[in-house]
């Protein structure tokens, strides 16, 4: 057993049948010694009598509110909640495996820029009785701040039969050089409470790996005279990194007819601008990529030839 | 270290080219060793990152840009800083600076080339003659010293008078191909900045 | 093995027009970038246009834009540059090139594969 927070406690509990549980003592946080009862949640049934109570905690029903009174006023509360081991693995049955990049991936993180800040996400089918807690540092042995906001209800879904719920948890690293080298990565801790079942997930990761460049903008085209040709061009995105010489980003043109049917033409360039031959109906996409560390494309920004 | 006298040419473009080289050829060689040694704990979250050009180089500190100084992060570990009298910038200490910042590269690709070239003769006596390093590779580090055109002392050659141990250092060439693809992509930023500047 | 093989140069007026022609073999070059670069007596290797594998997307030198224009024709693996307006300036050794890539580079050692050139003089 462990404190999770003032008053909160998780029992960690290998789960299999006609398991013993864990024994578990609890004391009343009073200078009180005599007269004492305990109780359970709402159930006005007394478990036991005295400054300490001893409970042997199996499954669920054994979880949740302890209350020590005297003449019906409440002393101390401690809530138990249960951390389950199936065949040594901990549980986690709260957030949803996404599955990218690559299986049991329930925490997916990424950075817009090397400013130090990121922000991360999950998902989840539980609508209620749900909380979150964040923790992040740069390494684990000697950890460096990173702080995080508080985690919030980002976008919902409807899957199938059930709807899908999207958290989001922004965070910044205290002391961030855009230009350092990352050797520590940054470490990321959720706690996760459904009723009365505790689960924690982690992710780690550098910076640089978790990099998704915003989209670039300003994407504009402009006719060239007597041709069927037209000069695209666009500009670095407004949350990047600069300078951008130096944090010089990549390019992928496209150009896409309306059919599938159409062949399709993809390049990259370093360049912001190009010229196209624009057919009717066609359209001009461009991507973004750092030019020297082949993290995510950014999504694609669009125009239409017409 | 031997610091040049000298200012740094201004055209950087040989150096950006051979830069651009540097790093294609170590993610290259990168992706070979990941794929050849994928029974190795060889890829970014297996390894422990070191850096053996640390306290003995400071290239991100003396490369740092301009518009990053201001930045008190990227100012910690500096024992000089561009900025000078009231913020003003020299041109002397700009170009003592760019100076700076070019040996430092220089003196991390000679680090880089003796290791990569002492553990290549260990990788050539290994019977499984499994994996070794690519000669694109050290020719294009090669390429980019001569021309950062600096002169400095040569470091002789590490011999080992010990039986290697194989799989250790194919778990060391591992740690220093990941470690040298971030170098050379620190290098990369720093040449087209330079470049444009 | 790829080999490219310029043609259509010579000798021209300012003002007059050329149309020169890269027919490449021994290998499909319909999936890669191909490009046009020059080289002057006594000055660099410069970047002239560059075009994508379908040909919808081309990147030009400022000093030939709107005058020069980049094409190709995939059924007969072959790349065209039209040269409209010629100047003096334009006097110089016209190379074609490819990485067997999708890069639209304009620097010469982003491209691999060189052809031999074909000399193109504008003299009045």
């Known amino acids: 057993i462990w404190e999770l927070k003032k008053d909160v406690y998780v029992v960690e509990l290998d789960w299999y049948p006609d398991a013993p549980g864990e024994m578990v003592v609890l004391t009343c946080d009073t200078p009180e010694e005599d007269g004492i009862t305990w109780t359970l949640d709402q159930s006005s049934e007394v478990l036991g009598s005295g400054k300490t109570l001893t409970i042997q905690v199996k499954e669920f029903g054994d979880a949740g509110q302890y209350t020590c009174h005297k003449g019906g006023e409440v002393l101390s509360h401690s809530l138990l909640l249960l951390h389950k081991k199936e065949d040594g693995i901990w549980s986690t049955d709260i957030l949803k495996d996404q599955k990218e990049p690559k299986n049991k991936t329930f925490l997916r993180c990424e950075a817009k820029n090397y400013s130090g800040r990121f922000t991360c996400w999950w998902l989840t089918t539980i609508s209620t009785d749900l909380t979150f807690s964040v923790k992040s540092s740069r390494g684990s042995s000697d950890p460096q701040g990173v702080t995080c906001g508080a985690a919030t209800l980002s976008a919902e879904r409807v899957r199938g039969d059930n709807k899908e719920y999207e958290y989001s948890v922004e965070c910044q690293e205290d002391s961030a050089c855009p230009a350092a080298e990352e050797s520590l990565p940054i470490e990321v801790m959720v706690d996760a409470v459904h009723k009365l079942k505790y689960e924690n997930y982690t992710s780690s990761f550098f910076i640089r790996d978790i990099i998704k460049p915003d989209p670039p903008k300003n994407l504009q085209l402009k006719p060239l005279k007597n041709s069927r040709q037209v000069e695209v061009s666009w500009e670095y995105p407004d949350t990047w990194s600069t300078p951008h010489s130096y944090f010089s980003l990549t390019f992928c043109v496209q150009v896409q007819g309306k059919s599938k049917r159409e062949k399709k033409d993809r390049v990259f360039t370093d360049k912001t601008s190009a010229t196209v031959i624009c057919r009717k109906n066609a359209s001009i996409s461009v991507r973004a990529q750092d030019r020297y560390y082949s993290s995510s494309w950014s999504e694609w920004a669009s125009v239409p030839c017409s | 270290r031997n610091l040049p006298v000298a200012t740094p040419d201004p055209g950087m473009f040989p150096c950006l080219h051979h830069s651009q080289n540097l790093l294609r050829a170590v993610s290259n060689m990168l992706q070979k060793a990941r794929q050849t040694l994928e029974f190795y704990p060889c890829t970014s979250e297996e390894i422990d990152h070191e850096d053996i050009t640390k306290d003995k180089t400071s290239t991100v500190e003396a490369c740092l840009p301009l518009e990053l100084t201001k930045n008190e992060s990227c100012l910690n570990s500096r024992e000089t800083s561009f900025i000078t009298n009231g913020s003003c910038l020299a041109s002397r200490k700009t170009s003592f600076m760019m100076a700076l910042c070019l040996s430092s590269i220089y003196e991390d690709l000679k680090m880089y080339q003796v290791e990569f070239k002492t553990m290549n003769a260990k990788l050539l006596m290994d019977p499984k003659r499994q994996i070794f390093l690519d000669q694109n590779m050290l020719a294009v580090i090669d390429e980019l010293m001569q021309a950062l055109n600096f002169n400095s002392e040569t470091v002789p050659q590490k011999s080992s008078l010990e039986e290697p141990d194989f799989y250790k250092t194919k778990i060391k060439l591992c740690i220093l191909l990941h470690a040298f693809r971030i170098r050379a992509v620190t290098i990369d930023r720093v040449m087209s900045y330079l470049n444009a500047s | 093995e790829v080999q490219l093989v310029e043609s259509g140069g010579g000798l021209v007026q300012p003002g007059g027009s050329l149309r020169l022609s890269c027919a490449a073999s021994g290998r499909t070059l319909s999936s890669y970038t191909m490009a046009w670069f020059r080289q002057a007596p006594g000055k660099e290797r410069e970047f002239v246009a560059t075009?994508?594998?379908?040909?919808?997307?081309?990147d030009y030198a400022d000093s030939v834009k709107g005058r020069f224009t980049i094409s190709r024709d995939n059924t007969k693996n072959t790349v065209y540059l039209q040269m409209n307006s010629l100047k003096h300036e334009d006097t110089a050794l016209y190379y074609c090139a490819t990485d067997l890539g999708r890069k639209l580079g304009t620097q010469s050692c982003e491209y691999g594969y060189w052809g031999q050139g074909t000399q193109v003089t504008v003299s009045s």
């Open positions: 075009i994508s594998p379908v040909g919808f997307i081309m």
